[in-house]
């Protein structure tokens, strides 16, 4: 009689994450008498995945009844499958005795797994920066397999060129990564803007995967000052305002300094947005100007998310008589009939 | 070691249950499987059936089958067989024994649970 | 169902004898077949397993040989703790069934 073979037709198998795989293995004899066992890897260090014989093994089922002694097929399913489970597999049969001894094994089938990559994650710069200035944006996706991945950016729908991308690890492993960091330079007009990475694998079936940033996170616009004065009813009075514009994040303190002296300060709360996603807010003072012998230097001191203060000053000449010396240029920021008769008193929208 | 430890002697009346149980130690419980044999005084051996402690598949003697359920409890390391409809014939010694999924020996046995079924 | 036919039913010998065990299956078994040794009041012990395979701890005065339908236990140089009785076992398919027994007594 021809001796036994064992016979695992499929060199390789491909199979997705989380499915089940079948491995193939049948013998072409029932003698000698002895159990099939299955293992990953050869040599001393292969690991034992299935033996006929005894041990417990949930997650494999044998594909026909292996109880029965005639049977020749010693396929088997192994569930769930996950990236730790590629490997080539080999089907090997024994030869009854104290201890059993292997007789023969199969060529072996290779198993790969295809393995989705995760949500892909992008991260931005930890400190805020201005327009005009570079930041980087990091974007990572893990666990997928095989290796080939594309990685794109973009910016508000326009593809992004500076970048640099890698894949982990250099050599073969069950699973890889990705990391890629590109460069973005910011505008004024990048608060509502989105930053993109775009991740396509063969498992995505050309559905791919988006990580995005928003750019109002990490962007920072400083506001522009203007001081005004408007005319006011009453002879001794004047209204200076200070016009905060453009600026983003809200984070706002404004200051007014009369001759260099802290008059009141006030944190921005009801301001008004621009359609770019900026702030406008406008702040003003009802200034006396019969307490006042000399001119007076207002100064509107601005602290921005915490940044270093930017200031504006008006000169109110006291000497002459109050007229108005400057453009309301904001004047669909006004709009209060309310008035002050003491110079601390404001109004700010 | 490896040990069978089978429950204490039963006296049952006909048409009544019994329930042995067998708690095995010193191997992977999961790993094997539990034969009751059982041995009618001054007769031979006779096998009743097995279970697989690792994924519970159960096979029955056709002779028993419907009068004999056999289960495992994997967290108590235990196996139970439990026989309904008891007459007098049942009178026996009962045997748990570990095998294999292969060579289906019996190479480790409990000392044996009598039971002994009488009006 | 594969039946197990053991002879003889029992024997008689002499410690240093020879002894010889058979059993016959209904069908083709292939290698598996088991036997068992029991004490009076004991468990079953086993000796050999597919047919051949010495049991870890089991005296080598033991041994199996057969395939197919024919096997024997063969015990060379009986001694004094040998005389119990010897059962086989066919394990070929299920219900596994066992020889009616052969009970070894001293001469």
């Known amino acids: 009689e021809e001796e036994l073979q064992v016979i695992q037709p499929d060199k390789s198998v491909s199979v997705a994450a989380g499915e089940s795989a079948i491995l193939h293995c049948t013998v072409t004899s029932l003698i000698p008498v002895g159990p099939i066992q299955w293992f990953r890897g050869a040599g001393p260090a292969r690991e034992l995945i299935y033996n006929q014989k005894e041990g417990h093994f949930p997650r494999v089922t044998t594909v026909s009844e292996s109880t029965k002694r005639e049977n020749m097929d010693f396929s088997i399913s192994i569930s769930n499958i996950t990236p730790a489970d590629a490997g080539t597999y080999y089907c090997v049969k024994f030869r009854k005795g104290s201890p059993d001894t292997e007789f023969k094994s199969g060529a072996g089938t290779e198993l790969s797994v295809r393995a989705k990559p995760s949500a892909p994650v992008v991260s931005g710069p930890a400190a805020r920066a201005t327009p005009q200035h570079t930041v980087s944006f990091t974007c990572e996706s893990h666990g997928f397999s095989p290796r080939d991945i594309t990685l794109k950016w973009f910016k508000n729908g326009n593809e992004l060129s500076d970048f640099q991308t890698n894949v982990d690890p250099v050599g073969e492993s069950v699973s890889y990564s990705i990391h890629s960091t590109a460069k973005v330079v910011l505008t004024r007009e990048d608060v509502h803007s989105q930053v993109i990475c775009e991740v396509a694998h063969v498992t995505l079936q050309g559905d791919p995967l988006r990580g995005t940033a928003n750019l109002s996170e990490t962007i920072r616009v400083p506001p522009t000052l203007e001081v005004t004065q408007q005319p006011v009813r009453a002879e001794n009075q004047v209204n200076v305002t200070c016009q905060v514009r453009k600026f983003y994040p809200q984070r706002l303190q404004l200051t007014w300094l009369e001759n260099g002296n802290v008059s009141r300060t006030e944190t921005a709360s009801t301001v008004t947005e621009n359609k770019d996603g900026t702030y406008n807010w406008m702040s003003w003072l009802l200034v006396n100007v019969s307490a006042h012998r000399d001119d007076v230097k207002l100064t509107c001191q601005v602290e921005h998310d915490g940044q270093p203060a930017v200031s504006k000053s008006h000169d109110l000449k006291v000497s002459a008589h109050p007229k108005e010396q400057g453009s309301n240029t904001a004047a669909e920021n006004t709009g209060s009939n309310e008035r002050h008769h003491h110079h601390h008193h404001h109004h700010h929208h | 070691q490896v040990q069978l430890v089978q429950s204490g002697a039963e006296v049952k009346k006909p048409g009544a249950s019994v329930k042995v149980s067998c708690k095995a130690s010193g191997y992977t419980f999961t790993s094997n499987a539990m034969h009751w044999v059982r041995q009618v005084p001054g007769q031979g051996l006779e096998w009743m059936g097995w279970?697989?402690?690792?994924?519970?598949?159960?096979k029955y003697s056709q002779k028993f089958q419907g009068r004999v359920t056999i289960t495992r409890d994997t967290s108590a390391t235990t196996a139970y067989m439990e026989l309904s409809s008891l007459r007098s014939e049942d009178t026996a010694v009962y045997y748990c024994?570990?095998?294999?999924?292969?060579?289906?020996?019996?190479?480790?046995w409990g000392k044996g649970t009598t039971v002994t079924v009488s009006s | 169902d594969i039946q197990v036919t053991q002879s003889p039913s029992s024997l008689s010998a002499s410690v240093g004898d020879r002894v010889t065990i058979t059993c016959r299956a209904s069908?083709?078994?292939?290698?598996?077949l088991n036997w068992y040794q029991q004490k009076p009041g004991k468990a079953p012990k086993l000796l050999i397993h597919?047919?051949?395979s010495l049991q870890a701890g089991v005296p080598s005065r033991f041994s199996g040989s057969g395939s197919g339908t024919d096997f024997s236990l063969t015990i060379n140089s009986l001694q004094p703790e040998d005389f119990a009785t010897y059962y086989c076992?066919?394990?070929?398919?299920?219900?596994?069934?066992f020889g009616g027994g052969t009970k070894v007594e001293i001469k």
């Open positions: 024994a570990r095998g294999d999924y292969y060579y289906y020996y019996m190479d480790v």
């Open positions: 069908q083709s078994i292939s290698d598996f």
């Open positions: 279970i697989k402690a690792g994924n519970a598949e159960i």
């Open positions: 076992q066919q394990s070929y398919s299920t219900p596994l069934s």
């Open positions: 597919a047919a051949s």
